[in-house]
């Protein structure tokens, strides 16, 4: 979470940002609010990114002016028109790019006053585990998939059962670069698992954590998984 | 050269099925967002799915449930299994790259349903 | 959903006039997430303008488009006899979606 202020006179202009993830190949958000103005005439919004001349995005007078933004942008930023007056200054980025990762400033002006406020914005890709039962392997085990990674994850592998105990020597993981040659397939075996246990595949890098639970027993399999970002806010 | 070649059109009976093929080169079709439309007889253009590069599908309200956009990376080629077909899915469809826009279109395949 | 109207539905005009072809969104549209496409009989469309503004790569410069929030606009300086065709304004939505204009067809008067 990252507040800034400005001075405009007398008057101070809090615009709040929070550091975030984008997911490469999908749309992602950067994320800006401010005191809200009424006079939607009065507010320009202007997003830049360090390093790079020209603007990201500008929105000002009710509507975009892109007659300075850079190329590596064009067709591909919104902000949101219609909450700006409550104080969305968030931009929407299409088809997210690793080169999108950077240091970004939201800039505010309205009636009230100026501020802006820095966003520390990572770019890589993450995905939900799958957890299947292997049937093919010798004894039993259990395989956890998950498509797209960048950068490179960690997985380990936990269970309720066994708390604590280290599976590194009973589990072998494999990355696979995909066809676009920047994501990876994550894929991890676990052997000698028992029924009526649940196994955790967690997979981590510094953007993103996911984790695929399993619990097999003799009349059912259940699955969970879920995926947080991390350091963001 | 940046090219995009649709194909596995043809004359389909009512509630049959039918897979479309889009095999792109010069371009990697996993790293783009990738489209299908189409074009009634006569009539104007309508989008029909997207995929996006991380995988993520999206429809349009008058195909959901009954087709699937689809690739295989290996191959460089974008799918459109089209299911339950009906008369008013006849037409002209199209693969198409969206970068900054819809940049590069295919040629076309011609889907025909009627009995 | 966001509308995209197009008008005229047809423009009747002579080579070396000038055409001017409206888009009108049911909501506001983001400039970025405007462009506008060229098809002619038995051919695939052809991307003319993206962002509102930017000419596509290959793209004479007779081509310009404007406009933001709700209104955009299309303008062909000086009609050449391989530009009549039909017209189509697309955006992309926040569904995510994307959608098509009905077209404006530019005839040889």
């Known amino acids: 979470l990252i507040i800034g202020f400005g001075i405009s006179g007398k008057h101070f202009i809090t615009v709040t940002t929070f550091t975030s993830a984008g997911n490469i190949g999908e749309d992602g958000t950067l994320s800006c609010t401010f005191e809200p103005d009424i006079k939607l005439n009065g507010i320009v919004i202007q997003w830049l990114k360090e390093g790079i001349k020209g603007l990201v995005h500008e929105f000002k007078e009710g509507k975009d002016d892109l007659s300075q933004q850079h190329e590596m942008f064009r067709g591909r930023t919104a902000v949101f028109a219609d909450q700006v007056v409550v104080g969305n200054a968030s931009l929407r980025l299409k088809n997210v790019q690793l080169t999108d990762a950077g240091t970004y400033t939201c800039y505010i002006h309205t009636s009230k006053g100026k501020g802006n406020a820095n966003l520390e914005y990572k770019t890589g890709a993450f995905s939900m585990p799958e957890i299947n039962v292997d049937y093919n392997a010798s004894s039993e085990s259990l395989r956890c998939e998950a498509p797209r990674w960048f950068p490179q994850p960690t997985v380990a592998w936990a269970s309720q059962v066994d708390q604590g105990a280290n599976f590194s020597e009973v589990s072998n993981t494999s990355f696979e670069l995909n066809s676009e040659n920047v994501t990876m397939k994550v894929v991890s075996v676990l052997y000698n698992v028992t029924i009526n246990n649940t196994y955790s595949c967690m997979i981590e890098n510094d953007i993103a954590k996911a984790t695929g639970d399993i619990k097999v027993t003799d009349s059912e399999v259940k699955r969970r998984s879920q995926l947080e970002l991390l350091n963001s806010g | 050269e940046v090219q995009l070649v649709e194909s596995g059109g043809g004359l389909i009976q009512p509630g049959g099925s039918l897979r479309l093929s889009c095999a792109a080169s010069g371009f990697t079709v996993s790293s783009n967002y990738m489209n299908w439309v189409r074009q009634a007889p006569g009539k104007g253009l309508e989008w029909v799915s997207v995929?996006?590069?991380?995988?993520?599908?999206y429809y349009a309200d008058s195909v959901k449930g009954r087709v699937t956009i689809s690739r295989d990376n290996s191959k460089n080629t974008l799918y459109l299994q089209m299911n339950s077909l009906r008369a008013e899915d006849t037409a002209v469809y199209y693969c198409?790259?969206?970068?900054?826009?819809?940049?590069?279109w295919g040629q076309g395949t011609t889907v025909t349903v009627s009995s | 959903e966001i509308v995209l109207t197009q008008s005229p539905g047809t423009l009747s005009l002579s080579p070396g006039e000038r055409a001017t072809l409206s888009c009108r969104a049911s909501?506001?549209?983001?400039?970025?997430?405007l462009a506008w496409y060229q098809q002619k009989p038995g051919q695939a469309p052809r991307l003319l303008i993206y962002?509102?503004?930017s000419r596509a790569t290959g793209i004479p410069d007779r081509f310009s488009g404007s406009g933001s929030g709700t209104d955009f606009t299309l303008t062909i300086s000086r009609l050449e006899p391989e530009d009549f065709a039909v017209y189509y304004c697309?955006?992309?939505?926040?569904?995510?979606?994307?959608?098509f204009g009905q077209g404006t067809k530019l005839e040889i008067k």
């Open positions: 995929i996006y590069g991380s995988g993520r599908t």
């Open positions: 697309q955006q992309y939505g926040s569904s995510p979606m994307y959608t």
């Open positions: 198409a790259r969206d970068t900054y826009a819809m940049d590069v």
């Open positions: 962002g509102a503004s």
């Open positions: 909501q506001s549209v983001s400039s970025s997430y």
